[in-house]
């Protein structure tokens, strides 16, 4: 007859081994439960962004649920209703919807509430929170320390926006640093390794044309 491991009852990349009575799942890092069905991310990890309220899930498949404040949605309250469609920021500035107001994050070499002022060099330029002023091509910008952004590095930035987790891993920002919750089948601090080392010899191909030093799309 069929064995208890047929069809692999272990979720999220867990490996199944038969026991005298039934089966046992060995779960990859970040998952647990009889069938590795429970994510290791809980309310203690602070997964709800933008002031969302975290409550424990009612069933084992949902370790937490985020109740989002007005203006935010998504499973982690990470999505905001877009009020930037009118493109109020000039000179390629990035529009930020703060809920109570819109703000422009200006490209290097521009400043002002709507990025309307053209700047030229680092002279007399102060970058806050440990940022350093970088000149180049007639423009300049602040290279900000982790967790800060904006023209002068005065704004709190979301370090997860840079997509630091590989292979579809989900990023969470903590006071002690970033954490990646890996997609099934991957492990490592940044989800860079397949769980099963005896599997495929190559990783999924990188998208063509993207290089680490290139501007991110």
């Amino acid at each position: 007859g069929p064995g208890p491991c047929d069809g692999n009852p272990c979720a999220n990349g867990g490996s199944c081994s038969e026991t005298p009575r039934s089966f046992e799942c060995t779960c990859p890092r970040g998952f647990y439960g009889l069938r590795c069905e429970v994510s290791g991310v809980t309310c203690a990890d602070g997964p709800c962004f933008n002031g969302g309220l975290c409550v424990g899930g009612a069933d084992p498949d949902s370790a937490y649920i985020c109740h989002c404040p007005p203006g935010f949605q998504g499973s982690n309250c990470e999505k905001r209703v877009d009020r930037c469609s009118l493109q109020p920021c000039r000179n390629g500035g990035l529009c930020l919807d703060l809920g109570h107001a819109l703000r422009c994050r200006c490209r290097a070499g521009f400043a002002g509430p709507r990025c309307e002022h053209d700047l030229d060099d680092c002279a007399g330029r102060a970058c806050a929170n440990g940022g350093t002023c970088v000149e180049g091509g007639g423009a300049h910008r602040c290279s900000c320390a982790l967790g800060f952004g904006g023209r002068d590095c005065r704004e709190r930035a979301d370090p997860c926006a840079a997509r630091p987790c590989a292979h579809g891993g989900r990023c969470y920002a903590h006071f002690s640093g970033l954490v990646c919750a890996c997609a099934p089948g991957y492990m490592g601090a940044r989800c860079e390794f397949p769980v099963h080392p005896d599997g495929a010899s190559a990783l999924p191909a990188a998208p063509p044309g993207l290089r680490p030093g290139d501007p991110q799309r």
Epitope: S143, C144, L146, P159, P164, G177, G188, A189, E192
Partner: antibody, heavy 124, light 113 residues
Framework: QEQLVESGGGLVQPGGSLKLSCKVS????????VSWVRQAPGKGLEWIGY????????YYASWVNGRFTISSHNAQNTLYLQLNSLTAADTATYFC?????????????????WGPGTLVTVSS | DVVMTQTPASVEAAVGGTVTINCQAS??????LSWYQQKPGQPPKLLIY???TLASGVPSRFKGSGSGTQFTLTISDLECADAATYYC???????????????FGGGTEVVVK
Amino acid sequence: QEQLVESGGGLVQPGGSLKLSCKVSGFDFSNYGVSWVRQAPGKGLEWIGYIDPAFGRTYYASWVNGRFTISSHNAQNTLYLQLNSLTAADTATYFCVRVALVVAGVAYYGMDVWGPGTLVTVSS
Amino acid sequence: DVVMTQTPASVEAAVGGTVTINCQASQNIYSYLSWYQQKPGQPPKLLIYRTSTLASGVPSRFKGSGSGTQFTLTISDLECADAATYYCQSYYYSSGSSYGAFAFGGGTEVVVK
């Protein structure tokens, strides 16, 4: 312009200690880490360890065995390599290197920007 | 720890020729293999990462291939400026310490006649 500049190298006696600094600018630690690599005169490259400041993690080659320590001062965009219990075998040029870890969700793990290096000479 | 074995230690070829450098890993390193070029008195320069992707500004005469444990760097249409030492570098999962680590090959000196 992405840049790394090492400093702090010099002559040190066997058994002594030294702290190397690496000033970095022009990139975001969310996607990049910083590695230390050394090269003895006329020899090949040897990886020492790397720091992933965004994740608060530091990794070392097994041969380091606690003698070397990598740390960072994020507010000043400065990385450090503390060298202890030095011997003549540690004489080398020490490079501070940017490592492209995961950029826009894609894992690279390549060392794409190198500092000029700083020479450490261990001799009595 | 993973050991990266690079062959040959030295190779000589004429201008316009082709050189092939091999790099063998002692365990599966997937696609995490980079190649570097180093000239005397200079730091290394990244040529190729993720086995086959050219770094910015590197000419297409440089080609990387392979997967798993066997990797190759091929330099075609050799120029005098290609005379240098070439290193491979892996990133791998260290099961003993449960984290990622890097390792370099011993290097290959390319002499262009």
